[in-house]
């Protein structure tokens, strides 16, 4: 069984999710990479991807998602700006490696976006919510469509664990087919 871990981010509407996915530099530097959402009972859906081949430090923006692939650091940076409640969900980074199936990067991100002010909870209710105006699209990359001989028919179980501290991880075990990820646009 593959052991999957998640890190949970609890943010307010209007804030930015800013995360990284590490990858093996020598192996995947120029490979095309994607940011996916995994909804219960559905296969992962690609929301944005880098160009092919992936360009170093070249921002790709698709709506409110900005991807930057730092080849020299071996990391993909993902930002989701001006978060909305509907953005809540489970996300992952994958690397496209045709003709093989996408390679999933750990750890997954469990994003929880709540309504309310982006000031510290308990602070003055007059604090200003950060509604950041998104600049024009930088580059919009086309993401490939993959088909797979084995499909994931069910997303990993939604953990009921209470994850409140930054260091907590949700460990998902007995998940066998997760590495095979067909991608839909």
């Amino acid at each position: 069984a593959t052991k999957l871990t998640e890190e949970k981010y609890e943010l307010k509407e209007g804030q930015t999710l800013d995360v990284k996915c590490d990858y093996t530099l020598e192996k995947f530097a120029s490979s095309q990479k994607a940011w996916q959402i995994i909804r219960d009972g559905e296969m992962p859906k690609t929301l944005a991807c880098t160009e092919r081949p992936s360009k170093n430090s070249h921002p790709v923006q698709v709506g409110r998602i900005i991807l930057e692939d730092y080849h020299d650091h071996g990391l993909l940076r993902v930002r989701m700006v001006n978060l909305q409640v509907e953005d809540s969900g489970l996300y992952q980074c994958v690397i496209y490696q045709p003709p093989k199936e996408p390679h999933m990067l750990f750890d997954r991100i469990r994003l929880v976006v709540t309504k309310g002010f982006s000031g510290t909870p308990g602070s003055n209710e007059n604090s200003t919510q950060n509604v950041y105006k998104i600049p024009p699209t930088t580059t919009k990359a086309l993401c490939p469509l993959y088909t797979s001989p084995r499909t994931v028919t069910q997303a990993p179980p939604k953990s009921t664990a209470d994850v409140s501290t930054p260091d907590s991880e949700i460990n998902l075990t007995n998940v066998t087919d997760i590495i095979r990820v067909p991608v839909f646009n």
Partner: antibody, heavy 121, light 105 residues
């Protein structure tokens, strides 16, 4: 609990090199970036670079490129920062710090106690 | 290179509210952290993700962000809050602001 313990104070001559260590405990060493930050007397905090203990890859601030080397020994969960061609401007307290999470580069939630490096002829 | 701008100093009377700002290009797209640094001690994270307090940080510390300016607010400031405060963000590299010396009169 997470702890970062640094090596002791150093006195070096101009032109020499210094190697500061940072021993990590209380967590999986490979899982989190280690950063090095310094503060010179009367100056602010200055980020020097990060080390990915898993891959051994490092990213250095432009100011220190070619003069700093960050390495690690995973068998003893220790990160190292070596700074060469020292000048008096390198006199500072050097800190190692750990990322709060595996999936972020900032913030730095855990810090070493600091190592004072004095460069003097 | 990316820069974060802070006022060099801020003064406040005990019990009053202190506000320290940090501004930078496209800061609205980045998460801001704040650190407290006292002489002879290691930095302490007081705010992360713009407005979250780590455990152990008093409730009088709060953070907010509007557009490209982040603000650290200390309400009911105490003498023990006198320190240097630094904002931080991640551009291509990690960047600290120049620091603000908070004096409690």
């Amino acid at each position: 609990q997470v702890q970062l313990v640094q090596s002791g104070a150093e006195v070096k001559k101009p032109g020499a090199s210094v190697k500061v260590s940072c021993k990590a405990s209380g967590y999986t060493f490979n899982g989190y970036y280690i950063h090095w930050v310094r503060q010179a007397p009367g100056q602010g905090l200055e980020w020097m670079g990060w080390l990915n203990p898993n891959s051994g890859g490092a990213n250095y601030a432009q100011k220190f490129q070619g003069r700093v080397t960050m390495t690690r020994d995973t068998s003893i969960s220790t990160a190292y920062m070596e700074l060469s061609r020292l000048t008096s401007d390198d006199t500072a307290v050097y800190y190692c710090a750990r990322d709060q999470r595996k999936t972020t580069v900032t913030p730095f939630e855990y810090w070493g106690q600091g190592t004072l490096v004095t460069v003097s002829s | 290179s990316y820069e974060l701008t802070q006022p060099p100093s801020v003064s406040v009377s005990p019990g009053q509210t202190a506000s320290i700002t940090c501004s930078g290009d496209k800061l609205g797209e980045r998460q801001v952290s704040w650190y407290q640094l006292k002489p002879g001690q290691s930095p302490v994270l007081v705010i992360y993700q713009d407005n979250k307090r780590p455990s152990g940080i008093p409730e009088r510390f709060s953070g907010s962000k509007s557009g490209n300016t982040a603000t650290l607010t200390i309400s009911g400031t105490q003498a023990m809050d006198e320190a240097d405060y630094y904002c931080q963000a991640w551009d291509r590299n990690v960047v600290f602001g120049g620091g603000t010396k908070l004096t409690v009169l």
